[in-house]
Amino acid sequence: SIPWNLERITPPRYRADEYQPPDGGSLVEVYLLDTSIQSDHREIEGRVMVTDFENVPEEDGTRFHRQASKCDSHGTHLAGVVSGRDAGVAKGASMRSLRVLNCQGKGTVSGTLIGLEFIRKSQLVQPVGPLVVLLPLAGGYSRVLNAACQRLARAGVVLVTAAGNFRDDACLYSPASAPEVITVGATNAQDQPVTLGTLGTNFGRCVDLFAPGEDIIGASSDCSTCFVSQSGTSQAAAHVAGIAAMMLSAEPELTLAELRQRLIHFSAKDVINEAWFPEDQRVLTPNLVAALPPSTHENLYFQ
Amino acid sequence: GAMGQEDEDGDYEELVLALRSEEDGLAEAPEHGTTATFHRCAKDPWRLPGTYVVVLKEETHLSQSERTARRLQAQAARRGYLTKILHVFHGLLPGFLVKMSGDLLELALKLPHVDYIEEDSSVFAQ
């Protein structure tokens, strides 16, 4: 049966026993800035082009053992959430991956900047259709990272990022705090904000909307047919990147402002239990859970 | 995220270093009264001192970025410091990434075309 997260983002009239918009997002290229990925996993084979871009710091610790499946874990799962054949949102989207996070899931602002610059140069050399950039990472507030995101957004690129998993104000983190970026918090099957250990999803006025981000089934790098459940605002951001890809594939001329407006318009309203947020943040945090548009664009979204 | 509101720095640290009038022999001194700023991550464990993104003013050309980077290296060498230019940015933001001692920040902030300098910091998978 359909995983809870795909059911949650699917308009009611499409909730059959399976989620299958077979060509969703086919006109859009989604760039993923993350760890290395297992690009020939059955769930994503042929859908992800691994670019030759790599800019990562060395792993911490003298006894660190680099295990390929662990190195690929985060990125493979997210690629599966965006475009996986069986558990993906935008099953028609093609992806390009850039490695900016090392085997411990750590990167640098500078490496991310160079990755964003690589995307801009690729766009200039070979203009294609609409571009979505997924940044499933967060660091402290960074003026330069936010500035780079702003420039890329002004070049017509849609950037989607994780709000962060620090149970804190997203405005204190980057790229979550960049106004031009679509910043995504995480909710669970009960429409509760996601708790992650002692922490959880970030919140506040720098968050644009929430999306499923707990117990999300996706491709596992443990084997070529394996699936695994992962949680976090990265998974939530991947859902919104997939939804954005489908919207842009249906309406390639959408501006960032129009896309943002549509994402908000089609979201489920006031379903999140706000008691989880600090009192002073409740009014600032959007009570929106991302969803695909309903039947108005049946022929476009579900070809 | 969340367009339409003022950008807020939170507890982001900003060091504003006023430019001195004596210019260390620079041909292209900045306009009078402008200040370049230094920024670093407010979360100390995430800081990566020793690597800095030098961001130049918006209309700076690639050739000027390269020239500014070389100038920094030359001035640092005169003071006995080794520096390494790791990357020259163009396409999104003009500037360069440099590996150098923090002692050279004041010098770097006085370079022509410099808008601000940010110390590198860590980002993490979420």
């Epitope: 690009s39 020939d40 042929g46 082009m49 054949r85 069986d86 047919t225 | -």
Partner: antibody, heavy 115, light 109 residues
Framework: QVQLVQSGAEVKKPGASVKVSCKAS????????ISWVRQAPGQGLEWMGW????????NYAQKVQGRVTMTTDTSTSTVYMELRSLRSDDTAVYYC????????WGQGTTVTVSS | QSALTQPASVSGSPGQSITISCTGT?????????VSWYQQHPGKPPKLMIY???NRPSGVSIRFSGSKSGNTASLTISGLQAEDEADYFC?????????FGGGTKLTVL
């Protein structure tokens, strides 16, 4: 264009081993693994397993597990399928195909097991 | 015995439409979006005609279409032509492997 080119026909005695090669070209190798499928005379298709060009990982069908070994040589973009302890019912045309989706196929290699 | 069940043979006259079924279980056809159909002419390798239930690779005629309901997938060929005479195989993912149907011989009368 995307191509998979296989090695030539083989005749083997029962108990022997056979090694079939498949050279891939015309696409980004790491985006797909290679599946091996066989077809006995007048019969249907049987999936034997898969190997990754990315990291060399394998996934073998239960029926041939223990007798089959798939390997890659990334320097020559070639995949090998070795089948040991051959029996007469291993007589078949052996195909390599691109990925699990099997969207492109090699021309086939006839393996005859006969005493 | 194959994991997926197909009729051994079907036939139709030129211009007609025919449908070939492929029945599995919730662990294969019913559980995945990845049902494929292959055409094989004698002495040739199989050729992919439909992937992921209903998608056609470029170069494949629009006369070929695929669908799925529950544990059964179907291949429909409309406007039957002489060159469609061939064997047709379905395949599906399982949790760890791939399975094929036994094949259907299509005769164009």
């Amino acid at each position: 264009q995307v191509q998979l080119v296989q090695s030539g026909a083989e005749v083997k005695k029962p108990g022997a081993s056979v090694k079939v090669s498949c050279k891939a070209s015309g696409y980004t190798l790491t985006s797909y693994g290679i599946s091996w499928v066989r077809q006995a005379p007048g019969q249907g298709l049987e999936w034997m397993g898969w190997i990754s060009f990315y990291n060399g990982n394998t996934n073998y069908a239960q029926k041939v597990q223990g007798r089959v070994t798939m390997t890659t040589d990334t320097s020559t973009s070639t995949v090998y399928m070795e089948l040991r302890s051959l029996r007469s019912d291993d007589t078949a045309v052996y195909y390599c195909a691109r990925g699990y989706g099997m969207d492109v196929w090699g021309q086939g290699t006839t393996v005859t097991v006969s005493s | 015995q194959s994991a997926l069940t197909q009729p051994a043979s079907v036939s139709g006259s030129p211009g007609q439409s025919i449908t070939i079924s492929c029945t599995g279980t919730s662990s294969d056809v019913g559980g995945y979006n990845s049902v494929s159909w292959y055409q094989q002419h004698p002495g040739k390798p199989p050729k992919l005609m439909i992937y992921e239930v209903s998608n056609r690779p470029s170069g494949v005629s629009i006369r070929f279409s695929g669908s799925k309901s529950g544990n059964t997938a179907s291949l429909t060929i409309s406007g039957l032509q002489a060159e469609d005479e061939a064997d047709y195989f379905c395949s599906s993912y399982t949790s760890t492997s791939m399975v094929f149907g036994g094949g259907t011989k299509l005769t164009v009368l």
